[in-house]
Interface confidence: low
């Protein structure tokens, strides 16, 4: 049995921010899980995890540089993403596993949410600006 | 001193109501994530409900979601746990517990238990 992943089909990051709700077709309440949000086609990065377990506060982080939190429901968890670049612009899947109790559970692969970054250019700003011309 | 004094427990018919109360004290409950669980004769305890400091948001498992509802009133330290349409399944001791961190996660402090009968 595989679980089922509702997401939308486009976001628009206006602010370089947006929030991506992964609805699941199982009740994540006391269980074991590993929620995962992937960048591209392939789903090569992993931009952010929530893991949550019964002994532990909800964790949630980034391998990848990415600046993002998450938030829990019964049914769906809801990454949001800060600082996007344009060029993140890209199609990003919902992952999930639940570890515990058995038997070990992941999802069909969902269609994925196009995340258009529009907004601010987030250019680093030069430490020392050029020479002002007289 | 944390306490947490459960009440409301006893025998009801298959498809009667319950209401359980959950009187706290010894720590600012206006501030603490609050659960219900229970434990059923000869089984481990499972986590019914749980419900934010604020009581906007609350969580549910599959066995009860749509018959049971968690509710507090932070002016009173009262947890509430208001169970519809119930079951023989539904027959456990139920605890009041404070749970510092999310909905799926362990408690700090937990009540004596009150008991519930579900029997015709």
């Known amino acids: 049995n595989k679980i089922l992943v509702k997401q939308s089909p486009m976001l628009v990051a206006y602010d370089n921010a947006v929030n991506l709700s992964c609805k699941y077709s199982y009740n994540l309440f006391s269980r074991e899980f590993r929620a995962s949000l992937h960048k591209g086609l392939d789903s090569a990065v992993e931009v952010c995890v929530v893991y949550g377990n019964y002994s532990q506060q909800l964790q949630v982080y980034s391998k990848t540089g990415f600046n993002c939190d998450g938030k829990l429901g019964n049914e769906s968890v809801t990454f949001y993403l800060q600082n996007l670049y344009v060029n993140q612009t890209d199609i990003y899947f919902c992952k999930i596993e639940v570890m515990y109790p058995p038997p070990y559970l992941d999802n069909e692969k969902s269609n994925g949410t196009i995340i258009h970054v529009k907004g601010k250019h987030l250019c680093p700003s030069p430490l020392f600006p050029g020479p002002s011309k007289p | 001193e944390v306490q947490l004094l459960e009440s409301g427990g006893g025998l009801v018919q298959p498809g009667g109501s319950l209401r359980l109360s959950c009187a706290a004290s010894g720590f600012t409950f206006d501030s603490a994530n609050m659960s219900w669980a229970r434990q059923a004769p000869g089984k481990g305890l499972e986590w019914v409900s749980w419900?934010?400091?604020?009581?906007?948001?609350?969580y549910y498992a599959d066995s009860v979601r749509g018959r049971f509802t968690i509710s507090r009133d932070n002016s009173k330290n009262t947890l509430y746990l208001q169970m519809n349409s119930l079951r023989a399944e539904d027959t456990a001791v139920y605890y009041c517990?404070?749970?510092?961190?999310?909905?799926?996660?362990?408690?700090?402090?937990r009540g004596q238990g009150t008991l519930v009968t579900v029997s015709s």
């Open positions: 419900i934010e400091a604020p009581g906007v948001q609350t």
């Open positions: 517990a404070r749970s510092p961190f999310g909905p799926l996660y362990g408690f700090d402090y």
